[in-house]
Interface confidence: low
């Protein structure tokens, strides 16, 4: 297996996932494409944790670009030995992967909490409340209760969809970073085998 090639594939995947996380998080600020709920501070508290923008987004770009740079990075080498430098790079990618694990982990935790608490909405008695906070997430299984939120329109579907997307994207990022920890450790210990015969396309 070519550890550098695999890292590069993971890096490219993370860039795409990070961008999707940022988009999903931004959409949470605009239920039904309207800006007034954000300006009136009528958004779920977990939207303001920037889990998709920071955790699953910007923070994920650092390890992503580190991983992408591994395959074509010659490094200076270690005492003139190129492979030794490559090993150092692979091991340093483990540190970058741990940062990615922290970011994606944050994204997953906040998205899960956002899903469990449910949206801030105008409920059927005319007050802005976390209507489903006391249901411990059971509202997710009973869509008939979603009509308790009367404004913004379809806010439950909006929140559930986007927080679920963030949860899934964060989970995939977490797994990919975990793979890169293993990949980096193996690449650092076993050596950086990048002969044409051993290239491994992820």
């Amino acid at each position: 297996m070519c550890y550098g090639k695999c890292a590069r594939c993971i890096g490219h995947s993370l860039v795409g996932l990070a961008l999707l996380c940022i988009i999903a998080n931004i959409l949470l600020y605009f239920p039904n494409g309207e800006t007034k709920y954000a300006s009136e501070n009528h958004l779920s508290r977990f939207v303001w944790f920037f889990s998709g923008i920071v955790g699953g987004g910007l923070l994920m770009l650092l390890p992503a670009f580190v991983f992408i740079g591994l395959e074509q990075d010659d490094c200076c080498g270690c005492c003139g030995h190129e492979n030794c430098g490559k090993r150092c790079a692979m091991l340093s990618s483990v540190l970058a992967a741990l940062i990615g694990i922290a970011g994606s982990g944050y994204c997953v935790i906040v998205a899960a909490l956002g899903l469990a608490e449910g949206p801030l909405c105008l409920d059927s008695f005319g007050q802005w409340n976390y209507t489903f906070a006391s249901t411990e997430g059971q509202y997710l299984l009973d869509t008939s209760t979603w009509s308790q939120c009367t404004e913004p329109k379809h806010i439950v579907e909006w929140n559930v969809s986007l927080f679920s997307i963030l949860l899934a994207l964060g989970g995939i990022e977490f797994i990919l970073c975990l793979i890169q920890v293993i990949n980096g450790v193996l690449g650092g210990i076993c050596g950086f085998c990048c002969s044409r015969q051993q290239q491994y396309d992820c």
Epitope: L122, D123, S124, F125, G126, Q148, T150, E151
Partner: antibody
Framework: QIQLVQSGPELKKPGETVKISCKAS????????VKWVKQAPGKDLKWMGW????????IYAADFKGRFAFSLETSASTAFLQINNLKNEDTATYFC?????????????WGAGTTVTVSS | QIILSQSPAILSASPGEKVTMTCRAN?????INWYQQKPGSSPKPWIY???NLASGVPARFGGSGSGTSYSLTISRVEAEDAATYYC?????????FGAGTKLELR
């Protein structure tokens, strides 16, 4: 036609209890909460609180906690306001109101009001 | 809580005149509603969301404002406009009403 029909005027003595009804028609009762507003003679409007017609959960404004109780008879699309241990200062007209949702939130349908007079 | 102060308390006007009444909040709010009440009747929704006329309200009425200061304007007062006008907010709990402006015609 959407309307809220309230019960007739009440004359009570201090210490007694009064129960006012508010029957909704022309819309789905459980989709809109019922709010209560007090207007003492010659005075301004005072919001008393509301009841969630979906869950039955009552919410009381700070000045109306204790002697006041909101309740429902969902099958009859009716909300009730009960005032216990009546005092002279409870003399007022009580309105039940529907709250309009959407982009703007306001009281779009008002009952005609029930006048409660407390006098010994 | 948000306190709404309406001024003037009593407003005298002659038919055809332009009148403006104001509603000030002690803290910024996102919008305000106005209700018209005539003696012996329940209040009627008049202007909602600061500037939107409720159903059946004549076009001579208008609403404006933002933040802490809002106003209701009648471009040409008519006899039927004599009533008390209340402003109301629910940007912040609890819901509050102003003390009202009584419009009298001379």
């Amino acid at each position: 036609q959407i309307q809220l029909v309230q019960s007739g005027p009440e004359l009570k003595k201090p210490g007694e209890t009064v129960k006012i009804s508010c029957k909704a028609s022309g819309y789905t009762f459980t989709n809109y909460g019922v709010k209560w507003v007090k207007q003492a003679p010659g005075k301004d409007l005072k919001w008393m609180g509301w009841i969630n017609t979906y869950t039955g959960n009552p919410i009381y404004a700070a000045d109306f906690k204790g002697r006041f109780a909101f309740s429902l008879e969902t099958s009859a699309s009716t909300a009730f306001l009960q005032i216990n241990n009546l005092k002279n200062e409870d003399t007022a007209t009580y309105f039940c109101v529907r709250f309009q949702y959407g982009d703007y939130r306001y009281f779009d349908v008002w009952g005609a009001g029930t006048t409660v007079t407390v006098s010994s | 809580q948000i306190i709404l102060s309406q001024s003037p308390a009593i407003l005298s006007a002659s038919p055809g005149e332009k009148v403006t009444m104001t509603c000030r909040a002690n803290s910024g709010i996102s919008f305000i509603n106005w209700y018209q009440q005539k003696p012996g009747s329940s209040p009627k929704p008049w202007i909602y969301g600061t500037a939107n006329l409720a159903s059946g309200v004549p076009a001579r009425f208008g609403g404006s404002g933002s933040g802490t200061s809002y106003s209701l304007t009648i471009s040409r007062v008519e006899a039927e406009d004599a009533a008390t006008y209340y402003c109301q907010q629910w940007s912040s709990n609890p819901l509050t009403f102003g003390a009202g402006t009584k419009l009298e015609l001379r």
